[in-house]
Amino acid sequence: CDLPQTHSLGNRRALILLAQMGRISHFSCLKDRHDFGFPEEEFDGHQFQKAQAISVLHEMIQQTFNLFSTEDSSAAWEQSLLEKFSTELYQQLNDLEACVIQEVGVEETPLMNEDSILAVRKYFQRITLYLTEKKYSPCAWEVVRAEIMRSLSFSTNLQKRLRRKD
């Protein structure tokens, strides 16, 4: 499956929108930094076959979409930016889902790399727990926004590597 060029443009747009969503000075939030244990090894793209990599990417985007679709998120961010961001993620999910369907017939290995998918889910559980413990404070959301920007950058890099393999 060849992800369309619009997909990588969507990635960049999503990152730009996320960067624009900041509302308070980041400098005041330093003490709220937290180790969410991003599963970096799931995004290095070496041990994966393409179908598995696409599944992990899909889970990453799906969980990001879910996180920013909550009521607490709506209260934290400027509505029009949040809507645009969610729209970009939704489009990426559609692209990836189309790829997942194509790749099922191409590879004999199981589509879902369960351990990798689980690692991504647990990562987002840690993020949600952190937000809960911090009572969804503005600084907690800033820390999470910075973390998601970092993890989406890893996703973007994995997609670039997948395109180079084609």
Epitope: A19, H26, F27, L30, R33, A146, E147, M149
Partner: antibody
């Protein structure tokens, strides 16, 4: 390869202005903050201030507030430290270093090579 | 501002010695404490971040510990290339501040 490359040594007279630079490469420049550190001859490290190149938000140490200006041009991945009127006491080595912002990653993991500023009449 | 106090300000040691440098913050900084090594004419080099995490490429003889206000840098077996000045720095809140430095000299 991540690199921070600073502009060359400067010799200035008291009262003159100066702008030194720090160019980042090998990483996403807007994903890291850039901090500036002063080291006067034979002395320790002093933290001056920091900039977030993504939005040019700055913060200064009280000792340097109003004495220097930190800026950045993200289009050319460069941060700046400037003086409008130098004093002899500004003679020092100035370092830039990158900081991961709110991400859980090593602080100030890469440093520039330093810019030696000499102010003398 | 948070004050960082290092001790000792200098020490003499021999190759193979175990060396300990302490750093005390004037208020709690959780684990947001970094250690740097600086050699004459060179930029500082990050050794330890978040109080105890070893920076990539740094030899395992360097270790850090502590939380809150009291922190320690330990060099388990001093090597010739370790003779330098060491600085602690807090990154809990702005302005970031450095300790005054500890110079490790050859005995």
């Amino acid at each position: 390869e991540v690199q921070l490359v600073q502009s060359g040594a400067e010799v200035k007279k008291p009262g003159e202005s100066l702008k030194i630079s720090c160019k980042g490469s090998g990483y996403s420049f807007t994903s890291y903050w850039i901090g500036w550190v002063r080291q006067m001859p034979g002395k320790g490290l002093e933290w001056m201030g920091i900039i977030d190149p993504s939005d040019s938000d700055t913060a200064y140490s009280p000792s340097f507030q109003g004495q220097v200006t930190i800026s950045a041009d993200k289009s050319i991945s460069t941060a700046y430290l400037q003086w409008s009127s130098l004093k002899a006491s500004d003679t020092a080595m100035y370092y830039c270093a990158r900081h991961p912002g709110l991400n859980w990653a090593p602080d100030f993991d890469y440093w520039g090579q330093g810019t030696l500023v000499t102010v003398s009449s | 501002d948070i004050q960082m106090t290092q001790s000792p300000s200098s020490l003499s040691a021999s190759v193979g010695d175990r060396v300990t440098i302490t750093c005390r913050a004037s208020q709690s900084i959780s684990k947001f404490l970094n250690w740097y090594q600086q050699k004459p004419g060179k930029a500082p080099k990050l050794l330890i971040y978040f109080a105890s995490s070893l920076q990539s490429g740094v030899p395992s003889r360097f270790s850090g510990s502590g939380s809150g206000t009291d922190f320690t840098l330990t060099i388990s077996s001093l090597q010739p290339e370790d003779f330098a000045t060491y600085y602690c720095q807090q990154s809990n809140t702005l302005p970031f501040t450095f300790g005054q430095g500890t110079k490790v000299e050859i005995k």
